[in-house]
Interface confidence: low
C-alpha cells in the first residue's frame, strides 16, 4: 500500500494532525525532499556568519563569513579570522611567520621555506614571510655546455661519442 505521505512534495510536510494532508512548511523551516513528516528548521546565519543564500521552503539557508573572516568545515560550519599574508592565526591572534617560514594566504599556517639544497639546487630568490624561496638550477646544471634538462651522459662505449 502506498504511503499517502509520499505524495507530499518538497516544501511541505505530511501533517498527521490533519489526516495526512500536505501542509506548507511554516516560516523559517524547509523540506528539501518529498514525503517528509516534518520540516527542518532553517539555519540562521547569526553573528560572524552572513547569509549567502536565504532559506526557502525547499532549501536550507547557506552561510558564509563576514569580511575579515573565512569559512571552515563542511557547509561553512565555522568562521575563522583572516590574517595578513606573512602571518598565521594563533590563540593570541594573528602572529608574524617565524624566520624560515612563510604564508602567502590570509588563512592557514606558516610553512617552512623550501630547502633547495635537498634537491641539489641553489637559492635563486630569498624567501620572505609572505613568499617561499625560489630555487635555481643546481651548480652541476650551470657547468659549461650543460643543460638543466639533459640527463647525465651514459658511460662511453667504443665507437660512440658522448651526447
Amino acid at each position: 500500500l502506498q504511503d499517502p505521505c509520499s505524495n507530499c512534495p518538497a516544501g511541505t510536510f505530511c501533517d498527521n494532525n490533519r489526516r495526512q494532508i500536505c501542509s506548507p512548511c511554516p516560516p523559517n523551516s524547509f523540506s528539501s525532499a518529498g514525503g517528509q513528516r516534518t520540516c527542518d528548521i532553517c539555519r540562521q546565519c547569526k553573528g560572524v556568519f552572513r547569509t549567502r543564500k536565504e532559506c526557502s521552503s525547499t532549501s536550507n539557508a547557506e552561510c558564509d563569513c563576514t569580511p575579515g573572516f573565512h569559512c571552515l568545515g563542511a557547509g561553512c560550519s565555522m568562521c575563522e579570522q583572516d590574517c595578513k599574508q606573512g602571518q598565521e592565526l594563533t590563540k593570541k591572534g594573528c602572529k608574524d611567520c617565524c624566520f624560515g617560514t612563510f604564508n602567502d594566504q590570509k588563512r592557514g599556517i606558516c610553512r617552512p621555506w623550501t630547502n633547495c639544497s635537498l634537491d641539489g639546487k641553489s637559492v635563486l630568490v630569498n624567501g620572505t614571510k609572505e613568499r617561499d624561496v625560489v630555487c635555481g638550477p643546481s651548480p652541476a646544471d650551470l657547468s659549461p655546455g650543460a643543460s638543466s634538462v639533459t640527463p647525465p651522459a651514459p658511460a662511453r662505449e667504443p665507437g660512440h661519442s658522448p651526447q
Epitope: 547569526k46 553573528g47 560572524v48 575579515g68 583572516d82 595578513k84 602571518q87 593570541k92 591572534g93
Partner: antibody
Framework: QVQLQESGPGLVKPSETLSITCTVS????????VHWVRQPPGKGLEGLGV???????NYNSALMSRLTISKDNSKSQVSLKMSSLTAADTAMYYC???????????WGQGTTVTVSS | DIQMTQSPSSLSASLGDRVTISCSAS??????LNWYQQKPDGTVKLLIY???TLHSGVPSRFSGSGSGTDFTLTISSLQPEDVATYYC?????????FGGGTKLEIK
C-alpha cells in the same frame, strides 16, 4: 577594562588631510575590528569604515576615495586619514570596537574636528 | 547602501510612559540590527544587538523587536536617565549604516 581614545588636531584647513588616531587599551587589535563613525554638529551618526583584525578594510562608498584606515598592532593604534577636507567634514569623530558578532560594544569619547581656514 | 529611517525624529514623553521608536530599512536585513544610545554629553553606548538581545548591563525596561525591514525599540517605563538620542544600525550589508536618530525628551 577596554577603552578607546581618539586624538586629533582639532582644527584643519580646507583641502588638507585629516589624521586621527584611536588608541585601544585592554583589548587586542588582532582579535577585534575598529570602526570609525562621525557626527556632524546637530546631525546623526555616519559610519566611515572599518579595519578588521587581519588588517583588511571596508569603507563608506561615498567617502572611499578620500579615506584610508590603517593600524599598528604593536602600538594598539588605529589611524584614520581623510584627504581633501571641506567644511562638510566638520564633525565629532568616534572610533568603536567591533566584536565578532558585529556590534560596536565600546566607543571612544570622540574628538572634535573643525575644518576652517 | 542600505538606508535606515527612524521615526519619530524627536519625541517628548512623561516619566513612567511606554515609549516606542521605529526603524525601517530600505531592504530586508533579517535580524541584523543594533540599537545605540547617545547621551547629551556625546557618550555612545550599545543597548541591543541582533534586533532583540540586550547588551550586558542594559536595564530590562529596554527591548527590541522586528524582522526584515521594520524594527522597534521599546522603553517600558521611561526613566530620567533615558533622555538621549537613539540610533538603529544595520549590519546586514557593508557599509553598515545608521538611522537618523530619535531624540527623546521628558515632558
Amino acid at each position: 577594562q577596554v577603552q578607546l581614545q581618539e586624538s586629533g588636531p582639532g582644527l584643519v584647513k580646507p583641502s588638507e588631510t585629516l589624521s586621527i588616531t584611536c588608541t585601544v587599551s585592554g583589548s587586542s587589535l588582532t582579535s577585534y575590528g575598529v570602526h570609525w563613525v562621525r557626527q556632524p554638529p546637530g546631525k546623526g551618526l555616519e559610519g566611515l569604515g572599518v579595519i578588521w583584525p587581519g588588517g583588511s578594510t571596508n569603507y563608506n562608498s561615498a567617502l572611499m576615495s578620500r579615506l584610508t584606515i590603517s593600524k599598528d598592532n604593536s602600538k594598539s593604534q588605529v589611524s584614520l586619514k581623510m584627504s581633501s577636507l571641506t567644511a562638510a567634514d566638520t564633525a565629532m569623530y568616534y572610533c568603536a570596537r567591533v566584536t565578532g558578532t558585529w556590534y560596536f560594544d565600546v566607543w571612544g569619547q570622540g574628538t572634535t574636528v573643525t575644518v576652517s581656514s | 547602501d542600505i538606508q535606515m529611517t527612524q521615526s519619530p525624529s524627536s519625541l517628548s514623553a512623561s516619566l513612567g510612559d511606554r515609549v516606542t521608536i521605529s526603524c525601517s530599512a530600505s531592504q530586508g536585513i533579517s535580524n541584523y540590527l543594533n540599537w545605540y544610545q547617545q547621551k547629551p554629553d556625546g557618550t555612545v553606548k550599545l543597548l541591543i544587538y541582533y534586533t532583540s538581545t540586550l547588551h550586558s548591563g542594559v536595564p530590562s525596561r529596554f527591548s527590541g523587536s522586528g524582522s526584515g525591514t521594520d524594527f522597534t525599540l521599546t522603553i517600558s517605563s521611561l526613566q530620567p536617565e533615558d533622555v538621549a538620542t537613539y540610533y538603529c544600525q544595520q549590519y546586514s550589508k557593508l557599509p553598515w549604516t545608521f538611522g537618523g536618530g530619535t531624540k527623546l525628551e521628558i515632558k
